[in-house]
Every structure is written in C-alpha cells, then in structure tokens.
Interface confidence: low
Amino acid sequence: IYGGQKAKPGDFPWQVLILGGTTAAGALLYDNWVLTAAHAVYEQKHDASALDIRMGTLKRLSPHYTQAWSEAVFIHEGYTHDAGFDNDIALIKLNNKVVINSNITPICLPRKEAESFMRTDDIGTASGWGLTQRGFLARNLMYVDIPIVDHQKCTAAYEKPPYPRGSVTANMLCAGLESGGKDSCRGDSGGALVFLDSETERWFVGGIVSWGSMNCGEAGQYGVYTKVINYIPWIENIISDFGGGGSGGGGSAKFVAAWTLKAAAHHHHHH
Amino acid sequence: MASMTGWKIHYTSTAHACPYPMAPPNGHVSPVQAKYILKDSFSIFCETGYELLQGHLPLKSFTAVCQKDGSWDRPMPACSIVDCGPPDDLPSGRVEYITGPGVTTYKAVIQYSCEETFYTMKVNDGKYVCEADGFWTSSKGEKSLPVCEPVCGLSARTTGGR
C-alpha cells in the first residue's frame, strides 16, 4: 500500500494473507470462502493445498494467526493468464469453517443497490501487506482511502504504451489520485477494495486488487480493481454448487479450472 | 305306538372370555365390546403425541387376539409420550429449553439463537416444537437446523472498536 497508514485491530477483520509462490491477499466471505484475484493463485493451480492462508493478524510475520487451508480453488473461466486481467477473480474454498470474532469477520458482497456507494469520487479503502513507498513489503497491515476514478478517464490512462489497447474492461474499476501517491501495489493483489454501505452500516467488497502501472502511486495512473458486482451470480453459483460448509479436511485439494485455461509463461504484473 | 327316535345329546361349548382390555394411559381400545371371546381382537391407538411401545421397542401398530385359553396373545403396550430427544447442537449458536430444563417431549419448545454480534440466524426464527412424528420442527415446518450465518462487514473503523 502506497501512501497509507497502519491498520488497527478489528479495522479489516476480513483481511486474509495468502502465501504461495508470492505474497498476496484475499477477503473472507462467509466463514469458509476467500475471495481473491485469479492471478494471485494461478501459479498454485497444480497444488492448491500448498496455499498457506492466514487470518486474524495484523503483522505479516507474526506467529499468532489463524491458519486455514484450501480445499479447492475456483478460477473464473473467462480469466486468461497471458492476455490481460479481464475476469481476474477467484474463490478459495477453505477445508474448515473459521470461528468468527472481532479479528476475523467476513466482508459483505455488494447488494444490488451498492452501485450508489461506488460512484466516481466515492471513497473506497484498500488494505494489504504489499510494497510501500519505501520499497519493502509492509510488516504491519496497511490501508489507504482512495476515490473511485471515472471509468473513461481510467481507460484513457491505460490506452497509451506500454499498455495494450483495451486493457481496462467493463469488468474493472479504477481508484486513486490523479496526483498519485496513494495506491495499492505488488503484494496487495487479491485484497479487497471496500466501501461502506451507509444504509446498513456494513462494509462490502467493491473491488479486488488486480493490476496497475509499472510504478505504484504514479501520477496520472490508477490502481485497477476487479469489479465485484459484475460477478455476484458467478460467486453465488459456486458457493451454492460447492457447498457452504467446509468438509473438515481429508482428500487432496482441488484446483477447479475446467474452463479453457491456457498454460503460459508467467508475466510478472505488479499487483 | 311310541316312536323310537333315540337319544339327543346337546353339546355346548363356552369359549373363555378374555380379560377386558384396559387401555393404557393416553391410549384407547378399538373396537370396544362388552365381551371378547376366542378370535376376537382389539387394537390400541395412542393419542397424538404418544407412541406405542412394547418394552423398549416402538410398534407401528398393535392388535391382540383372544386365545382359546382366555388369554390375550400379546401384552398390553404402553402409549409413551413422543420424545424428540436432545436437540442437535447449532454451530456458532446455542439452544435454550423453553418448556422446562431438558424437556424434550411432545409439544416441548426450544429456542435456538446465534452467538451475538458475529452471527445472525437464517432460515427461520429459531423456535422449534417437538411434534408427534418425533422431530423438532420450526414454525415453518422445517425439520433441519436453522443456520447461524456470520455477520459480514463489521469493522472497528465504523463501530469504534468492539
């Protein structure tokens, strides 16, 4: 997180740390699912059980955390690893339910009315243990409040080289300051960009940290997030089809990618 | 001239009547007869909320037949109040006995509730009644447990810490 501040206990109780090949993040849904970015877990697709999932902690290196393990990983069938970041969304089913408390609480999915809290200039909050402006992964969970950017303005920002045309799709939303300085960064991938629903006084996930400019916090560029509201049917179908309840373990973890995933060389994108 | 018709011997047999069947508490006898003799039978039907038991064994139905020695061929069963048994534990919740401590018999009421703050009840209001079929049943007729679903989107940023 660039230009952010330290989170306090209970501020982001849905925050999940995912350790696999790299550091990434996710957000707890219900008590046995994690919402994350497809690119964050793609490398582990052949061994989903290798994902080390931690929650209930502020400190990235703390030994005090709640451990969870993956039973199955579901990558969106429209995500293609070597062709941009459209449909950069995945679900991890945990092999056990976690106990909910003030430090571990799920994030809400957006209601139909959520768009009214996610208009241009509405403030969302990104959190994570990713790179800070000092160039190191954060030891303490950090967060930053950033405004939503007009979609056309964001599309235009990424129309020029080195970004290929059409990088920003209708399945994405952008957030950040035109002047730069506040952004998500490498290592924050998969984490939630959350918004406060002022009617219910509950926080909901509007975006998933996905990608951005080569240099985090760069002026005139913005962080790009998967637009979660476009995927509510996909999320609900998977959760209903593959069960709300954790199985309690046993058996090998599955990586569900029954949808034309191309094996490709990994392009190192920063988020 | 006297007719020679010989002797007439009249045989009469009296079947032993069986003891009058007294219905067990919370049951009734059918059919009700003044007397039950050889091959007569009766059935016992329990009131709603009671089940037929022969010893420890539940019976689907009960019919006894009067035997020639004047005894019934089976013992009188009991009509025992249906017991739904202890309610299942509710993950992330608890159950309270409303009718009385540990009371799990017919028409007993229990109330499920979820752990405060972090869980909320889905499916129904959590009130279940022990019904005649031996199942705890919600006011909506569900026999499955309610669900304690985690409350989402709580944060110390808006609640000022918990």
Partner: antibody, heavy 125, light 107 residues
Framework: EVQLVESGGGLVQPGGSLRLSCAAS????????MAWVRQAPGKGLEWVAT????????YYRDSVKGRFTISRDNAKNSLYLQMNSLRAEDTAVYYC??????????????????WGQGTLVTVSS | EIVLTQSPATLSLSPGERATLSCRAS??????IHWYQQKPGQAPRLLIK???RSISGIPARFSGSGSGTDFTLTISSLEPEDFAVYYC?????????FGQGTKLEIK
C-alpha cells in the same frame, strides 16, 4: 424352576477388564429381555444395562456407556457383561436379571422378576 | 434421569403392625413403579409391579398404590420375615432408576 447363575467376578485393578457370565435355565430364555443390575457394598440397587430378547438393541446407564457391553447367546441360554476400563466406583455385586417376558400381561417391560444370587466385582489397586 | 426418593430411610415397627412405605418420583411416571424386597445376603425379590399389580407367589398382605409422582407400598400386618430393605424402581424412562431404599426393622 427359574435359575440364573452369575460367574466371572473377582478382584481387578483400575483400568482392567472382566467378563461376567450368566447361565439361565428353567424358562424360555429367548422370550425375555435380560438385564444386569448392580449393588455397591452397603448401597442401593443400580440398573446397569439391558438387552432385548432377540439381541437387537442394548441400553446402558450413562456412567458405563462405552466401557461396558451387554450381549447374549440365545443358543447357549447365556447373558454376558464385558467390562473394560474398570473404575473403583464399579465395585459392586452384579446381578443378572430377567426383565419380564416379552409375551406377558402388562403395559411395559422394565421390572426385574427373576434374579441370580450375584457375583462380586472388586476394582482396587 | 428420574430420581426416586424413598421415605422414611428406616421404619421401626413390630410384627402385626401395618407398614406404609413411600416413594416419590422427581417427575410423573404414570404407574410405572415396581417394588422389591431384599434381605441381607440375598438378591432382591419383586413384590408389586405397575404400582399396584400383585405378583404370583407374593403374600396378599403386600399391596401398592399411587400414580404420577407419589407411591405407597403397604404391608397390612407385618410378619417376622418381612423385616428387610424395600426398594422402588421406575420404568417410565428406559434409564431405569431405583430409590435409595427403606429399611424396615423390628422395633
């Protein structure tokens, strides 16, 4: 004449095991539910376990569940009680008893009409 | 479990007298109460079943009454051989329980 003769009692250390037997005669064994009832020295009676006439179901008091197993062999007119993980509080005279005939007058079985003379089980180190 | 409480714990009477023994259940047990007699060094003996039903071979001086929660065993005229410990037992619940016993002793 109904006869029930228990055997298999004795001294055993805590945590140990014993198998009690009850040989039945003088009645149609497979018409009767059978039970074990115990009596600690100087104390009252305590029902331990029941097995139905055909062996289809067993019932236990809570304190012996998982440790004791009641069984029967109708061909041998015999009742058994396998006692594992014995505790000092299991010390008692164990009586074998019939639990009223399956085909008999009455509402409900559950009274003990014939009793053996008992066998003493002592659990002590 | 259903708790049976017998009273008195000890009853001192003389032969020829009438003995009244009480058994109270912690909840209603209908008429599912049975009475036993036990003499020192002997196994118990069934006296009365289902609160008031007589048992073949048991002298007529033994009788029982009651239903619900309160039950009584009555010995109309005590004989010397009647001095023993008496237990009630319930079968309303399949987790059978006995009372703690009443000792009937010679005065």
């Amino acid at each position: 004449e109904v006869q029930l003769v228990e055997s298999g009692g004795g001294l055993v250390q805590p945590g140990g095991s014993l198998r009690l037997s009850c040989a039945a005669s003088g009645f149609t064994f497979n018409d009767y539910n059978m039970a074990w009832v115990r009596q600690a020295p100087g104390k009252g009676l305590e029902w331990v376990a029941t097995i139905l006439f055909d062996g289809s179901r067993t019932y236990y008091r809570d304190s012996v569940k998982g440790r004791f197993t009641i069984s029967r062999d109708n061909a041998k007119n015999s009742l058994y009680l396998q006692m594992n993980s014995l505790r000092a509080e299991d010390t008692a005279v164990y009586y074998c008893s019939t639990e009223s005939p399956y085909y008999s007058e009455g509402y409900y079985q559950g009274y003990f009409d014939y009793w053996g003379q008992g066998t003493l089980v002592t659990v002590s180190s | 479990e259903i708790v049976l409480t017998q009273s008195p714990a000890t009853l001192s009477l003389s032969p020829g007298e009438r003995a009244t023994l009480s058994c109270r259940a912690s909840q209603s047990v209908s008429t599912s109460i049975h009475w036993y007699q036990q003499k020192p060094g002997q196994a118990p003996r069934l006296l009365i079943k289902y609160a008031s039903r007589s048992i073949s071979g048991i002298p007529a001086r033994f009788s029982g009454s009651g239903s619900g929660t309160d039950f009584t065993l009555t010995i109309s005229s005590l004989e010397p051989e009647d001095f023993a410990v008496y237990y009630c037992q319930q079968s309303y619940s399949s987790l059978y329980t006995f009372g703690q016993g009443t000792k009937l002793e010679i005065k």
